[in-house]
């Protein structure tokens, strides 16, 4: 089971209308550039076999991947939203740095790896798709971690 006290984010992180709006605007702008609507990164397959108490840990992994492999490399795009949203998400990632799982997390890593593989396989359009789903990442992170 996860060390749940560390796998938590305060509700106030998600009660900031300005940055919430900017995150959703960024997602909307990127989704307009996403021509692959058949694939969804944040959906049922990502959470398959993951218990309620493990959801935040999973979302931490997704957040870290999105920051390191998608947002940082694409940081010059979708301005001015990107320069505001990336630091916000990085702060959330930092607050989850002590969120760990005791025991086997293989099923979680497997699910996250499938998401990573999909993004990598699609190349730049996979990165655009991930940015286009930042609204889902924001909401899923909130729902899993508060």
């Amino acid at each position: 089971a996860p060390i749940s006290s560390h796998c938590r984010l305060d509700k106030s992180n998600f009660q900031q209308p300005y940055i919430t709006n900017r995150t959703f605007m960024l997602a909307k702008e990127a989704s307009l550039a996403d021509n692959n609507t058949d694939v969804r990164l944040i959906g049922e397959k990502l959470f398959h076999g993951v218990s309620m108490s493990e959801r935040c840990y999973l979302m931490k992994q997704v957040l870290n991947f999105t920051l390191e492999e998608v947002l940082f490399p694409q940081s010059d795009r979708f301005q001015p939203y990107m320069q505001e949203v990336v630091p916000f998400l990085a702060r959330l990632s930092n607050r989850l740095s002590t969120c760990h799982i005791e025991g086997d997390d293989l099923h979680i890593q497997r699910n996250v790896q499938k998401l990573k593989d999909t993004v990598k396989k699609l190349g730049e359009s996979g990165e655009i798709k991930a940015i286009g789903e930042l609204d889902l990442l924001f909401m899923s992170l909130r729902n899993a971690c508060i």
Epitope: A1, K11, F14, I42, G43, E44, F47, H48, G49, V50, S51, M52, S53, R55, L136, M139, S140, R142, N143, A144, I146
Partner: antibody, heavy 119, light 112 residues
């Protein structure tokens, strides 16, 4: 094909007990949480409780103490044990699969089983 | 616990009509709202989740919108098979688990 079939409903006297079953096929209980919802005659839907993938259970405040959800993964069946039944517990009882997609959604649902509490 | 208020509680409409049902939450639920359709004697069926995402196999005449406290389900052109009762349902996280899932009172769509 995913299917959920409830059974065990019927007529029970006030103060009595009943155990409802929800047999599932087409998916594993080790991969999905399951919920129970009820609907009194001519009324709306009311959430009773949920059993998570790891076996943890959570209940609506009004259901705590009288209602217990359990499962037998080897039989692919979820149960709802109802004790100290009252007339106001008369309802159709549904089980549904909880699909978490970043938010919980309930899909699909079983056909329901009618419980009538009357003397 | 969050309270979901649906309006109207019932409405009469004709085939081809545009129908709008609203669901108001007593607190901010972001986009954590789903819509279900229930026909008499049948189990509820998922229509929409994330307030606006159409569930698999649901006809495109159904659409959902809204966030925060005000939500709408729209049927663009009512079909004979759409006469049913519609329920909104919210998920509220971060509070006690005993009030995580809540349903609205329902809206019955009848033939005029």
């Amino acid at each position: 094909e995913v299917q959920l079939v409830e059974s065990g409903g019927g007529l029970v006297q006030p103060g009595g007990s009943l155990r409802l079953s929800c047999a599932v096929s087409g998916f594993s209980l080790s991969s999905y949480a399951m919920i129970w919802v009820r609907q009194a005659p001519g009324k709306g839907l009311e959430w009773i409780g949920i059993i998570d993938i790891d076996g943890s259970t959570y209940y609506a405040s009004w259901a705590k103490g009288r209602f217990t959800i359990s499962r037998d993964s080897s039989k692919n069946t979820v149960y709802l044990q109802m004790n100290s039944l009252r007339a106001e517990d008369t309802a159709v009882y549904y089980c549904a699969r909880d699909r978490f997609v970043g938010v919980d959604i309930f899909d699909p649902w079983g056909q329901g089983t009618l419980v009538t509490v009357s003397s | 616990a969050v309270v979901l208020t649906q309006s109207p509680s019932s409405l009469s409409a004709s085939v081809g009509d545009r129908v709008t049902i609203t669901c108001q939450a007593s607190e901010d639920i972001y986009t954590n709202l789903a819509w279900y359709q229930q026909k008499p004697g049948k189990a509820p069926k998922l229509l929409i989740y994330w307030a606006s995402t159409l569930a698999s196999g649901v006809p495109s005449r159904f659409s959902g919108s809204g966030s925060g406290t005000d939500f709408t389900l729209t049927i663009s052109s009512l079909q004979p098979e759409d006469f049913a009762t519609y329920y909104c349902q919210a998920c509220v996280y971060g509070n006690a688990a005993d009030s995580r899932y809540t349903f609205g009172g329902g809206t019955k769509v009848e033939i005029k």
